[in-house]
């Protein structure tokens, strides 16, 4: 049987001779050279050679455990004479023994990390890691310990874990933002003779909101003309904040002062400036100077820094309103007036008033813009603004008159303003009802009494547009001895009825019926309309067959004896 255990070989042998590994030996070997030892497997004949007579194995090259820690070979012992094995082929191991020949290497040459400024001592920043290629299972060659070479007293590193933490209270980004920390990793548990490696950690303090906004000056002054419309920017103010990003964002607001309702402040998001704008119309004559208290504040505040004081600042803004020569101002934006359509010429409808808003209080004169009143229906007293009629009105022609009145400063005619006047013409019952159409009808010669031959309808131009109450009757001059009667249907219609049995067209071919139509409005209006009734020959169904055409062609000589 074979007589060996596993072989151990120290790595990185630096001797001049081959490094002795060990000896293969069979108990069949009598030392007479009859056995031959053969080596095969990992590195056999190259890395490892064997004396075929003695079984001594030697390493021909310097070995590196970190490259290959174990070699597996096979041993044979054969009888030189017969060539037969005297032992079964057997596998054996050569284990490379570690020495501390590798320094720790960090996973990154340079680390970058951030940590909020003003963090508590011991706040985690980053973890660095170094690895050592030596054998961790044997000795301390691979036992790494971390230490800080550069970066104290600001940061510390945990020796076992490589965790870097803050080590100093109140580190202020606004004082210093960047730190370069050098960390060493040393093997042999940090003992003397251990190998080491280093890495650089670039640490940036990130901003927190630990600084309030501050106005660079306590008072600002701006000027604006009184004519500035709402929304006009009149000046910019800027507070500075040592922080950055959203921690440096500023919101401006007006917190006090007589101009609280008159001005606004808006924040320019790009420049972080406060823009003072006009909110309401200014009037130099009412107020010439306004003061505002403007506050700049951080919208995002960290409660833990509130002990540092309020995260806002205020400044006084003085706004001087400049005088502008203004046109007259009417007491209303528009005037709505009413007048009855039966108003006589020179009837006063109402009046307008305008005043020069300037301190000078220049007198004004009034006029009607004739482009809006081409027919000169209305006029105005240039001195007191009274509007009066200069022509008769008719609601049925025009219900609304829309005119423009101009007020002009007498001393400065360039300064003028205009106002619309809407004049409603109120209805008066000044139109009589009349027939809705021209009525020309016929009656059959053989008609019976009380037969309906025509229904009459009426219209009235006055109000109400619908809902009139009309009455119909024969005119007094035709009422007695009439051949026809009017039946008022009480629904704004009336019927013409025959009053006798039979009509003779040769005796009387056409009747003219005067009908009086009246409304029941005030004052009552009435008109007389004439209905033409022709006498015609009809068939037994009452359909007209023939009438005297001459009755239509020659109206002279027609009887009105209806």
């Amino acid at each position: 049987s074979w007589m060996w255990n596993q072989f151990f070989l120290l790595e990185e042998y630096t001797g001049s001779d081959y490094q002795y590994v060990g000896k293969l030996h069979s108990d069949q070997d009598r030392g007479d050279g009859s056995l031959k030892y053969i080596l095969s497997g990992d590195g056999a004949g190259d890395l490892f050679i064997i004396n075929e007579n003695t079984g001594d194995i030697q390493a021909t090259k310097r070995l590196d455990r970190e490259e290959k820690p174990v070699y597996i070979l096979r041993a044979q012992a054969i009888n030189r004479r017969t060539g037969r094995p005297v032992e079964p082929e057997s596998e054996f191991i050569i284990k490379i023994h570690d020495i501390n020949d590798n320094e720790p290497i960090f996973t990154k040459e340079v680390y970058t990390a951030t940590v909020p400024e003003m963090s508590d001592v011991g706040t985690f920043v980053v973890q660095v890691t170094a690895t050592d290629a030596d054998d961790p299972t044997y000795g301390n060659s691979a036992k790494v310990v971390y230490s800080i070479l550069q970066g104290q007293p600001y940061f510390s590193v945990e020796s076992e874990t490589g965790i870097i933490k803050t080590a100093l209270l109140n580190m202020d980004r606004e004082n210093r933002e960047q730190y370069q920390v050098v960390i060493q990793a040393k093997d042999m548990g940090g003992q003397m003779g251990g190998l080491s490696g280093t890495t650089t950690v670039n640490i940036t303090l990130t901003d927190v909101n630990d600084n309030p906004p501050r106005f660079p000056q306590s008072t600002y002054q701006f000027k604006t003309p009184e004519s500035s419309p709402p929304g006009t920017p009149i000046g910019r103010i800027k507070a500075s904040d040592a922080d950055v990003g959203e921690n440096a964002e500023i919101e401006y607001s007006i917190t006090d002062g007589e101009g609280l309702d008159m001005f606004d402040v808006i924040t320019d998001q790009e420049t972080q400036e406060g823009i003072i704008t006009v909110k309401k119309l200014l009037d130099f004559e009412k107020k010439k100077v306004y003061t505002l208290k403007v506050e700049a504040s951080n919208p995002y505040v960290e409660p833990r820094f509130l002990y540092l004081g309020p995260f806002k600042d205020s400044a006084t803004v003085r706004i001087v309103v400049e005088d502008v020569d203004e046109p007259p101002v009417f007491s209303k934006l528009a005037y709505i007036l009413q007048i009855r359509e039966d108003a006589q010429i020179n009837t006063t409808i109402g009046s307008v008033t305008a005043q020069d808003p300037d301190a000078a209080r220049n007198p004004v004169k009034y006029s009607v813009d004739r482009h809006t009143d081409m027919d000169r229906i209305f006029n105005i007293d240039s001195g007191n603004g009274s509007i009066f009629t200069s022509k008769l009105l008719d609601r049925e022609t025009l219900l609304w008159h829309n005119i423009t009145v101009i007020a002009t400063e007498i001393n400065n005619p360039k300064q003028s303003s205009r106002v619309p006047l809407y004049i409603k013409v109120l209805d008066v019952n000044d139109n009589a009802p009349e027939f809705a159409e021209f009525y020309e009808t016929f009656v059959c010669e053989k008609a019976k009494a009380d037969q309906l031959i025509q229904t009459l309808h009426a219209v009235d131009k006055d109000d109400p547009y619908s809902g009139h109450q009309f009455s119909f009757s024969l005119a007094p001059e035709a009422a007695s001895g009439s051949n026809f009667t009017i039946q008022d249907n009480k629904d704004n219609t009336a019927g013409i009825l025959t009053r006798k049995n039979g009509y003779n067209r040769h005796e009387m071919s056409t009747y003219l019926l005067p009908v009086v139509i009246s409304d029941n409005d005030y004052p009552v209006q009435s008109s007389t309309g004439t209905v033409t009734v022709r006498v015609c020959a009809c068939d037994h169904h009452g359909n007209m067959q023939s009438c005297h055409a001459e009755a239509l062609i020659h109206p002279t000589g027609l009887s009105t004896g209806a």
């Epitope: 019952n429 109000d463 109400p464 009086v516």
Partner: antibody, heavy 116, light 107 residues
Framework: QVQLLESGGGLVQPGGSLRLSCAAS????????MSWVRQAPGKGLEWVSV????????YYADSVKGRFTISRDNSKNTLYLQMNSLRAEDTAVYYC?????????WGQGTLVTVSS | DIQMTQSPSSLSASVGDRVTITCRAS??????LNWYQQKPGKAPKLLIY???TLQSGVPSRFSGSGSGTDFTLTISSLQPEDFATYYC?????????FGQGTKVEIK
């Protein structure tokens, strides 16, 4: 059916004021002229005032002109008569009536007595 | 103002009688005349408008005629419910005026 109902009458001292109302129903109130007619105790009828359908025009008897004001609220179907500076001769039953020329419907009347 | 004069001021009649009341205007009023009936403690009621047009719901025994200045109200056959005071009214021109009334009593 057409109904007119007056209210607001009563005893008032000379120089005093009173406001009569007339609630209308059963017809399109806004389409009709409306009138007030009065009747002194044991006397005949006297036309007092009329207002057109839209309320745009009003007319008065000379005896009440400047003292009485007729008005209407078409949204409430109501006619009014505001009577100021009342005199003893204004004592009467006041009727509201539909129409501007002939009065086809009348209310039951409300008595106004002017007396010290 | 136009004066309206009714005659007679009062009359006594029996049921079934034909009754005629006249109304005269101080100037021509064409056909713009109305007739009203009033019973004690009640509101007036329109009988006839435009001189001769019968108001809806009014019995046909009532009729009106005339134009200009002279007008007539006729009750062809007097009924018990017709005993009342009758008024004429012109609406030709403002102010509209009433006659002094005609009282029809039972004989």
């Amino acid at each position: 059916q057409v109904q007119l109902l007056e209210s607001g009458g009563g005893l008032v001292q000379p120089g005093g004021s009173l406001r009569l109302s007339c609630a209308a129903s059963g017809f399109t109130f806004s389409s009709y002229a409306m009138s007030w007619v009065r009747q002194a105790p044991g006397k005949g009828l006297e036309w007092v005032s009329v207002i057109r359908s839209s309320g745009s025009s009003t007319y008065y008897a000379d005896s009440v002109k400047g003292r009485f004001t007729i008005s209407r609220d078409n949204s409430k179907n109501t006619l009014y008569l505001q009577m100021n500076s009342l005199r003893a001769e204004d004592t009467a039953v006041y009727y509201c009536a539909r129409g501007g020329g002939y009065f086809d419907y009348w209310g039951q009347g409300t008595l106004v007595t002017v007396s010290s | 103002d136009i004066q309206m004069t009714q005659s007679p001021s009062s009359l006594s009649a029996s049921v079934g009688d034909r009754v005629t009341i006249t109304c005269r205007a101080s100037q021509s009023i064409s056909l713009w005349l109305n007739w009203y009936q009033q019973k004690p403690g009640k509101a007036p009621k329109l009988l006839i408008y435009a001189a001769s047009t019968l108001q809806s719901g009014v019995p046909s025994r009532f009729s009106g005629s005339g134009s200009g200045t002279d007008f007539t109200l006729t009750i062809s056959s007097l009924q018990p419910e017709d005993f009342a005071t009758y008024y004429c009214q012109q609406y030709y021109t403002s102010p509209y005026t009433f006659g002094q009334g005609t009282k029809v009593e039972i004989k």
